[in-house]
Every structure is written in C-alpha cells, then in structure tokens.
C-alpha cells in the first residue's frame, strides 16, 4: 500500500500545534485511503529544508528567498504548490518588485548612481535585496560591507533598520532609520511617501504600493516605473516593467520522489474543507496563536505549480540574478560595454557540431550550449544558461509567453536590402503523392500524416488549427490512422510512423530522421500519405538537390499540394494553394541580451552568411545540407525587425489568435509553466 502521509515541517511550537490541529481535522474529513498529515518539528526553515532533502519530512511553505536556498545543491527542492491572494477568479501568486520615480525626473535605471533612494527596509525583498542585488555589480568597490557600498553609490538614502551610526548616509533621508511604523518612511507605504515628499528620487517597492497609496489615476500618472532596459513605463504596466517577479509563499518538496501529486491532493482537499470561509472549527489561513503559521494568513487558497517548473524558472531570471549577486558577491573583472560571448542553444548532437564549428570560427564571440528539445533550449535561455537560438513561429509564441523577445528574423528571398527588410512570411502547405489521386483536404481522416514536429508552424499549428476548427476536438491521433509528429507522446499513433531508433523515436530533434521539414517530407516519401511542410520543402529535396540516398532520385512533378477548397495543384502553385501564411523563423533572446545578440549576429552573418560562396572550404552559417541546423538552410540573411520587436507584433494578430485557439490542445509543459507565471 503506498504511503499517503505528507510529513509537514513546522518551525515553532505554535506551528507544531497548528500542524497537529491540521492533522486531526483532515483525519475527520478525508477517507482512510486518502492523504494524511504527520508533523515534524525543526528549529528553523533551513533545518526543514535539510530534513526534506534527507527524506525526514516532505513539505514546508517558504518565502521566495528560502525557495532559492531550498533549490541550491545539495537540497535540490522544487516548488510544488503556490499560495494565492486576491480572488479565485483573479488569483495572485506573485508580486512585482518595482522602481518608482516621479514623471519629470528624467533619469533611467543605469543612471541611479548619485540619486537619492527610498527603501522599505534593510534586507527586505522588494525594498533592498532585489534592487541592490541587481545593482550589485555597479556598486563601487569594495562591495563589502554592502551597506557602505550602497551608501557610496546613492547620494543619500532612507533604508529603515540600517545602522545609522556606521552608515549615516543610509539614514540621511529619515533620521534614525527607525525599524517600525514610527518611522514615517518605513515599509512599502513609507518608502513611497519618501519619494512623494521629494526626499528621495526613487522608491523601491512592490507594484501594488502605488495603487494602495494613490486611489486617483491622475495622481498615479505623476509617477513612472524604471525598466531594466533603461526605459520608463506608466505605473500600470508593471508586468512589462519591473525589477523582478517574486512568488509570495510556496510549498516546496524534493525534486525526485517528492510526493508532489500527494501534496497537491492533500492541500486541494484541505482548502475545500478548511479554506477561506469554509469552517469555523479549523481554518487553514488563520493563526490564532501567532501570525502566518504554516501558511500566510492573507492567503485565499492554493494553486498547483506546473510540474515543468523548477525553482529557477519559478523565481525568474531577474530574482535569481539579484539573490545570487548578493549571496556570491561575484562580478565580472571590470564592467565594460563590451558584449560577452553569445551562448547559442543547439538541439542535440548534430546542431552541437555545427555550433562548435561556428564557435571556433567566431573567435570568442559564440559559445555553445546543448539541449535535447526546443522547449529545453527555451528554458535555458530563460534562466541564463543560454542566450539565443532561432525558432519556428510556433516556438516564438511559446518563447514570447515565457518572456523572451524576437531580435532578428530569417529572410529567405534574395534582395538588395535583405537585412533591412523582414519578409511577410512563407507558406504552410499540405503535400501528397501525385499517384494518390483521390486524396483531398476533405478526406484526410484515417490517412497517415507526417509533421515537422508538435508545436511548429507549418507542421502542426496551422494544419491542426484548421483541423480543430473542423472536428472540434484535440484527438488528432484518432483522426489520422498513424503518423509521425515528433514531440508526441511515445505511445501515440502519431509516433507510429517515426523512424528514430530506441529512445530517439519521435524525439523533436535531428536524432529522429523524420523531424523537421526534410524529415516530414522523407516520411511522406517512405511511409505517409500527407506531409505538412513549407512551400520550399519539395523543390529543396527533389531534382538531385538533396544527395541523400532516399532523396537523390525524387522528382518534384510526382508531388502535389492540397488546397483548402478541396482541389489539388502542382507544387509550384503554392501561392494559390496553401493552408496559411507562416511567420518566418526568428532569433529569440532575453530582453537584457537583446542589444548584444543583435550586434554579434549581424557581425557573424557578415563573416559567415550568404556572401560566403564556397561552403566546402569555409564555414557557412546558413548551410547544413538540407538539415536546417541552427538556421533554416534557405536563410539568405537575418533581418532587423524594426518595430516588430515583441512576439505578438512579430507573429501578427492572426497567427497569435490561431495558436491561442489551439492552446486547449497544447501538450507543451513549458507553455503551461510560463502561463502560470504570466496568465
């Protein structure tokens, strides 16, 4: 019989008492085969973290800073359940740390040196740890003691709870630096008042502070937020302009064998019976013998953290950077305007080899990082392990939802001004063998399908979006008799046609021979009835243009396109017979890397782009003999985006809407995780 006990870790006598009450009340409402609670008492949160790692306890609720400690080796814990605040309809699991300034003050984030600062309190998250952590490498050396470095960075501050004797500048704006509400500039409202009164130039608070202190929009409009990219935004645009997004209070468990489903089952049932306004005799979010015992008193309920989300992703790049800077205190030798090497994310073995060759030729400008799937690469870019990669539009959408931005677009047509003219897009098509003359768009049910990969534009999002509109359900594996859609569940009929061996079968990378445009076309040639690819795929792999044994004798005339009106046309008539126009593949990165990725890639394409004529004796960035490694092989150049510099603007309203409609069919664990952080 599986053990269905969750051992909750308590850090005080009062918490242990509430835990026992929690245990007893759960016993009275949960059937005997359901989850149960046991209580383990430890002296501190760090002891609880160690106990969970050592399998002596299973769960504890932590503030963000401790979630970071819990994630670090050797603890390796992960967030599993989040407390939420506000309403069930609009649950808030995060808050945003922001830098507020007066509208007319005219400086940016990178011009804070010499300004006057207002903090909620020394050592507090939004008011100190996050802003000072992010500014850490700009502080004057020596950076220890930290208070002295901060005092020398700003021209005056109010940092309640600081030592006014040793660091008088930190108390210059609030004599005495009192550590309670007796100090008018203490806490969130106090730090904002410090700015409002004109004592300081910038206040480090949370996003709700401004709304709680200024009910009137006209008054709020006198303030702005400083963004990390050295721009400003209105105070209500905090989701796009903050220092960090911080989880409020989170249950953590072991990463392996951590009982996360059991913990969720327990807490979900607990909130049903003992949540807000549920029961008089025991209340989960109330602490008669103290404050915030086991859970925050202000919490309204729990939400399950998506399983794909590790602590780094949950805490976010900015928060992790700030806390790591403060804890480790390491900075580059001397901060320069020089760009660091761009860490390119390569998918599996073959892309890694091409990336390595690029890296050698780039002379220190490009480094390589590997991952097994596109989503793993996106996650690595999010957390700073990698910086950039080029993505199909479907993944540009996921990357955008995860906070990444497009920076350059692949262009596929030769033109005089290639780098300045991003193209409208390419065509997604459905290809069939000419010999299968009875096959049309209207009778694909029961046929064998070939897809570039799940989540990609031409191979999945466009054809499956159109199909969804017709069949109104997501069981595409039942619609087709079998197929190869790399990235599908291994036991799905949409992996049946795939050719990868062993663990590589149906993997969404080049280890699966039917992956990508060329792979999907090969699948059609060898096994399938229809392939969903781009309009250039057939000509690029016929007439001897692909020397591989399976392709070298193929003839373009032996294939036709399915049109949406039920007719068929020759391959060259794609402009009048396609499923939809698809946005070109684009390079994505984090916002903080945007300028450097742009600069370095433009240099790299001038060295190794289409201007290189002999690819047998030189490194060519946009060539890999039909394998589309790192970039599509038909890329002519990487083009500037001009003002299409967000994923929505880049992909266009129509495509974003189409992918949004398919979201209910999404199997993307990363998309689920990212929409948890930003619904």
């Amino acid at each position: 019989v599986p053990d269905k006990t969750v051992r909750w870790c308590a850090v005080s006598e009062h918490e242990a008492t509430k835990c026992q009450s929690f245990r007893d009340h759960m016993k009275s409402v949960i059937p005997s085969d359901g989850p149960s609670v046991a209580c383990v008492k430890k002296a501190s949160y760090l002891d609880c973290i160690r106990a969970i790692a050592a399998n002596e306890a299973d769960a504890v609720t932590l503030d963000a800073g401790l979630v970071y400690d819990a994630y670090l080796a050797p603890n390796n814990l992960k967030p599993v359940v989040a407390e939420f605040y506000g309403s069930k309809e609009d649950p808030q699991t995060f808050y945003y740390a922001v830098a507020v300034v007066k509208k007319d003050s005219g400086f940016q984030m990178n011009q804070l040196r010499g300004k006057k600062s207002c903090h909620t309190g020394l050592g507090r998250s939004a008011g100190w740890n996050i802003p000072i952590g992010l500014l850490y490498c700009d502080l004057p050396e020596p950076r220890k003691p930290l208070e002295k470095a901060v005092a020398n960075f700003f021209s005056g501050s109010c940092a309640p709870c600081a030592d006014g004797t040793d660091f008088p500048q930190l108390c210059q704006l609030c004599p005495g630096c009192g550590c309670s509400t007796l100090n008018q500039y203490f806490g969130y409202s106090g730090a904002f008042k410090c700015l409002k009164d004109g004592a300081g130039d910038v206040a480090f608070v949370k996003h709700s502070t401004i709304f709680e202190n200024l009910a009137n929009k006209a008054d709020r409009d006198q303030y702005e937020l400083l963004c990390l990219d050295n721009t400003r935004k209105p105070v209500d645009e905090y989701k796009d302009c903050h220092l960090a997004q911080v989880p409020s209070h989170t249950v953590v468990a072991r990463s392996m064998g951590g009982k996360e489903d059991l913990i969720w089952e327990l807490l979900n049932q607990a909130q049903e019976h003992f949540g807000k306004d549920k029961s008089k005799e025991f209340q989960l979010f109330s602490s008669p013998h103290g404050k915030d015992l086991l859970f925050k008193d202000s919490a309204h309920g729990f939400l399950k953290v998506p399983p794909r989300m590790d602590a780094k992703m949950y805490l976010g790049y900015e928060y992790v950077t700030a806390i790591r800077n403060l804890r480790e205190g390491t900075c580059p030798e001397a901060p320069t305007d020089e760009c660091k090497p761009v860490k390119w994310c390569a998918l599996s073995h073959h892309e890694r080899l091409k990336c390595d060759e690029w890296s050698v030729n780039s002379v220190g400008k490009i480094e390589c990082v590997s991952a097994e799937t596109t989503e793993d690469c996106i996650a690595k870019i999010m957390n700073g392990e990698a910086d950039a990669m080029s993505l199909d539009g479907g993944f540009v959408y996921i990357a955008g939802k995860c906070g990444l931005v497009p920076v350059l677009a692949e262009n596929y047509n030769k033109s005089d001004n290639c780098e300045d003219t991003p193209e409208a897009g390419y065509f997604a098509i459905a290809v069939v063998k000419k010999s299968a003359s009875d096959l049309t768009w209207d009778n694909l049910k029961g046929k064998k399908s070939c897809h570039t990969a799940v989540g990609r534009t031409a191979g999945w999002n466009i054809p499956m979006g159109l199909l969804y509109n017709k069949i109104n359900h997501c069981r595409f594996d039942e619609f087709f008799s079998e197929g190869c859609a790399p990235g599908s569940k291994k036991d799905s009929s949409l992996c049946k046609l795939c050719m990868g061996s062993g663990l590589n079968l149906c993997e969404p990378n080049n280890k699966e021979g039917y992956y990508g445009y060329t792979g999907a076309f090969r699948c059609l040639v060898e096994k399938g009835d229809v392939a969903f690819v781009k309009h250039q795929t057939v000509p690029q792999n016929t007439g001897g243009k692909n020397p591989d044994p399976w392709a070298k004798n193929l003839n373009e005339k032996d294939y036709e396109l399915l049109c949406l009106d039920g007719t068929r046309k020759p391959v060259e008539e794609y402009a009048n017979c396609h499923l939809a126009r698809a946005p070109n593949h684009a390079v994505v990165t984090r916002k903080d890397k945007e300028a450097c990725v742009h600069k370095i890639l433009r240099q790299q394409q001038h060295l190794f782009g289409s201007n290189v004529t002999d690819c047998s004796g030189n490194f060519c960035l946009f060539r890999s003999e039909t394998k589309d490694l790192l970039f599509r092989d038909d890329t002519v150049c990487l083009a500037k985006l001009h003002d299409r510099n967000t994923y929505e603007k880049y992909l266009g309203e129509e495509y974003v809407k189409a992918v949004g409609n398919l979201r209910k069919c999404s199997t993307s664990s990363l998309l689920e995780a990212c929409t948890f952080r930003r619904p």
Epitope: K354, V360, G617, F619, S624, E625
Partner: nanobody, 117 residues
Framework: EVQLVESGGGLVQPGGSLRLSCAAS????????MAWYRQAPGKGLELVSG???????KYADSVKGRFTISRDNSKNTLYLQMNSLRAEDTAVYYC???????????WGQGTLVTVSS
C-alpha cells in the same frame, strides 16, 4: 573525402604529457576548421579544441592553459599537445574536419588517453 586517423594516445601519469596526431589522407590546406573532440566513458562527445585555417584557436575551459592545438598543412596533420594531464582527461580523443557537415555520424577509431597513477 579526406580520411582522418588519430594516434598518440596511451597511459600516462597525472601531471604527464602526450602529443596526439591526426593524419589526413589528403590536403588539409583548404579545410576551414579542424577540431579535437573527446568522449569519456558514459559521457557525450565534447569539443576539446578547434583551429581555423587562419590559425585562430578555441579551447574548452577545462583544458585552457594545458592543451595546445596546431595544424601543419604541409604534413596534412592536426596536433594536440596535452600537458599537466589529469584523471578527468581520460577519454577517447577524435579529430574532425567538419567536412561531413555535421549530420553523418562518422567518427574514426579515435585514440584512447588514460591518465592514472
């Protein structure tokens, strides 16, 4: 297509040195990039060092300052001088000229380097 044959591996004590050679069956003068990779037991292939036709070099962080890559176009040979060897350098070492354009899984026999006391 140029064939490549690696040699020079062997058993060496920690702190010792070895020089690996990679002899090509044809001219390497026009080859853009050559590199040494290694594969430790149970691990994936890892780039150790690379060199361009113009002589620009790159090294993995773990070997910087200890290994030196060079190519002699007149002898059609790529070299890897390995000094201050450590136990973690134990692996099969392969050379490549990237001419198979990444996707054909062709690697030579390699040469085994064992660092042990």
């Amino acid at each position: 297509e140029v064939q490549l044959v690696e040699s020079g591996g062997g058993l060496v004590q920690p702190g010792g040195s070895l020089r690996l050679s990679c002899a090509a069956s044809g001219s390497i003068a026009s080859i853009a990039t050559m590199a040494w990779y290694r594969q430790a037991p149970g691990k994936g292939l890892e780039l150790v060092s690379g060199i361009t036709r113009g002589g620009s070099t790159k090294y993995a962080d773990s070997v910087k300052g200890r290994f030196t890559i060079s190519r002699d176009n007149s002898k059609n040979t790529l070299y890897l001088q390995m000094n201050s060897l450590r136990a973690e350098d134990t692996a099969v070492y392969y050379c490549t000229d990237y001419s198979r354009k990444y996707y054909q899984d062709y690697w030579g026999q390699g040469t085994l380097v064992t660092v042990s006391s």
